[in-house]
């Protein structure tokens, strides 16, 4: 860990102050204790070394203490998400102290200058925490720093500089530019708190990644792969306002991390679960829906403390708005091909029927390609709780929906003009629920008819709990 700053003078030297205030040196970080859920209330400003405001404003020394740390600002005002988060924290933790770290003067700068100010802001928070620790009953264990964007790295510095170890840091889409690939002492990292959990919602492998792509916590959660967030596309943004801009899309995706966290506070009964996976592609294939050995966790405030020796990347799908929870299912489909199918890619859809509800028609996303005479794994998710699954309808879409598919079909036909029938055989579908971890096997409703071709459908009924079937034998594959 780096050594904290030396004399006060050095602290001031590091400040990138706007020209307007260079003449008047003032503490550039304020701590506003939000004493009411009412966002209009001015709250109380805490002052280092002054105990009176703590008493006057009812600071609870034994309760949890949240520090909310904003990021870079173009407007110089608090953004609207802040009040949502304050209110959600008050709702969930009635007795908690909620402190807003106001570093607006230092954040309302060129991005590079604001980045250079993160260290001094982190140091100010650490000094405040060191002072609070001198009070009876105040414990760093009860401190939870919540930093959004650039504020996540400020939280990292604070955790690094404080005497002792803070209980938890939550990074809400930590900023990427100037932090991606940086040394652990110059960004948020797992050694900054007893538990560091991170939500990544705006990561891009091409172009500018507003949020950091690399894992920086004990658990790093990538909702929807950490890139394109539902409800934030240009069309969605256009739909909600008179004009939509790329800026609005960026803001929507970056800020989604905050709303996911707020959701975890206010919709405690609808927790979203994330699943450990090595990468987004494997998750999209449905391979990673295990909860064994701490491989799944709640996201946001409800996350269970996990201190792995190495970073744990976790993934989930979400809805476009609150409550964000969806229900994940892994589907294993063994595809037998009795005819040489060539290169054709089927477009499959499933409809799930449950005791509580039926799903919409859901596409089976083919991440790479359908393997013939092999088990293919898919991820599907529903917005509603279907209850116990009873049956599944599998449809092979008939008419081509894209020029690309049409071209593939034509090419397949040209290479094999004497193969008029395109047919696959599917006897069983194995399903695992991510949320309940329950495994079920569904068998073809008509065991004599297990073939499916474009424009046709197959029905499967639950035939057993679990996945193992008695007397399972592989059918012989007849080639034409």
């Amino acid at each position: 860990s780096p050594t904290p700053f030396g004399p006060e003078g050095q602290l001031e030297d590091e400040l990138h102050k706007p020209k307007a205030i260079q003449t008047e040196v003032k503490p550039s970080v304020r701590f506003n204790l939000r004493t009411s859920k009412d966002p209009e209330h001015e709250g109380c400003y805490l002052s280092l070394g002054h105990s009176q405001p703590l008493e006057d404003c009812g600071f609870n020394m034994t309760a949890k203490t949240f520090f909310i740390i904003h990021g870079w600002t173009m407007s110089g005002i608090f953004e609207n998400w802040l009040h949502k988060l304050v209110s959600a924290l008050h709702t969930r933790e009635k007795d908690a102290n909620v402190v807003v770290v106001d570093w607006l003067p230092l954040a309302h700068q060129l991005y590079t200058d604001a980045v250079n100010n993160t260290r001094v802001v982190g140091h100010s928070i650490a000094r405040m925490l060191d002072w609070l620790q001198e009070k009876d009953d105040f414990s760093l264990e009860n401190v939870h720093l919540i930093g959004y964007s650039l504020g996540a790295h400020v939280a990292g510095y604070a955790g690094n500089f404080v005497k002792g170890t803070v209980g938890r840091i939550t990074g809400l889409d930590p900023a990427g530019p100037m932090f991606e690939g940086a040394d652990i002492h110059k960004r948020l990292s797992p050694d900054d708190a007893d538990f560091v959990d991170v939500l990544h919602t705006y990561t891009r492998s091409f172009g500018l990644s507003i949020g950091i792509q690399m894992p920086v916590g004990h658990i790093d959660i990538y909702p929807n792969g950490g890139d394109f967030q539902p409800g934030c596309g240009l069309n969605d943004v256009l739909g909600s306002m008179a004009y939509g801009t790329i800026t609005e899309v960026v803001k929507c995706e970056h800020e989604r991390a905050v709303h996911l966290f707020v959701d975890s506070l206010v919709n405690q009964d609808k927790p979203s679960f994330a699943f450990q996976c090595t990468d987004s592609n494997r998750f999209k294939k449905g391979i990673c829906l295990s909860c064994r050995k701490n491989r799944c966790n709640s996201i946001g405030y409800n996350a269970k403390k996990m201190r792995n020796k190495r970073n744990s990347k976790m993934y989930l799908k979400t809805r476009a708005g609150m409550p964000f929870r969806v229900y994940h299912y892994q589907m294993k489909i063994h595809v037998f091909s009795y005819k040489n199918m060539g290169e054709i890619e089927p477009t499959f859809y499933v409809t799930l029927y449950g005791t509580n509800a039926d799903s919409q028609t859901l596409p089976l996303e083919i991440v790479e390609r359908i393997e013939q005479n092999a088990t293919n794994t898919f991820l599907v998710y529903t917005e509603e709780d279907l209850g116990d699954l009873l049956k599944i309808q599998l449809t092979w879409e008939g008419a081509s929906q894209s020029w690309y598919n049409l071209w593939k079909e034509l090419r397949s036909y040209l290479s094999q003009p004497h193969n008029p029938g395109r047919e696959l055989n599917i006897r069983r579908i194995r399903v695992k629920s991510g949320e309940t971890q329950r495994k079920l096997t569904f068998c073809a409703e008509d065991p004599e008819n297990t073939s499916i071709s474009p424009g046709r459908e197959l029905w499967f009924r639950k035939c057993r709990d679990g996945w193992r079937m008695k007397n399972e034998t592989s059918p012989t594959v007849e080639l034409p």
Partner: antibody, heavy 120, light 111 residues
Framework: QIHLVQSGPELKKPGETVKISCKAS????????MNWVKQAPGKGLKWMGW????????TYAGDFKGRFAFSLETSASTAYLQINNLKNEDTATYFC?????????????WGTGTTVTVSS | DIVLTQSPASLAVSLGQRATISCKAS??????????MHWYQQKPGQPPKLLIY???NLASGIPARFSGGGSGTDFTLNIHPVEEEDVATYYC?????????FGGGTKLEIK
Amino acid sequence: QIHLVQSGPELKKPGETVKISCKASGYTFTNYGMNWVKQAPGKGLKWMGWINTYSGVPTYAGDFKGRFAFSLETSASTAYLQINNLKNEDTATYFCARRGYYGRRYFDVWGTGTTVTVSS
Amino acid sequence: DIVLTQSPASLAVSLGQRATISCKASQSVDYDVDSYMHWYQQKPGQPPKLLIYAASNLASGIPARFSGGGSGTDFTLNIHPVEEEDVATYYCQQTIEDPPTFGGGTKLEIK
């Protein structure tokens, strides 16, 4: 009781400078931002910008960059608006108005208004 | 910048009747369930006074005959029953993003 009391009316010639004051009382001055709003005779309200009363950082709206300057005297709980190189179109009533740093940032308390007349 | 269009520009209402003023925003001024739309009253020779904040909340000291409603891009201010002292110009304002902008104003007169 919360009050924002502004300085009296001003009659100026084009090219001159005017400095209007807005003295706050009844609340902690640095806990709310101070806005400036222009109202030309018979016209509507136009936001000129605001100053962060804690840090002293001013923000100017697009039409008010250049000749306009916001400043503070924190010890006296007073905000100032200075207009340099006055033009005829600066003839208007100028209001200061406070807004919270938190919440929905409406202007809950307004100054008494200062009428500036620019005439040769 | 967000443009606010108020209608009508002027309004004459009989005492005791209802006055309704509309304000249309060029884009949504909602954030989640909050509306960042506010209403002010300005009497001749006086500064504006906050009437309604966040679309429907009555500011302190304002009589209950004033009410506000709406969400997204369409908002209304209602005064019922109208009294003599309500003669003034009414402005809507959005603060969801800087710069805060005002509507053009609606002048209320008594018939």
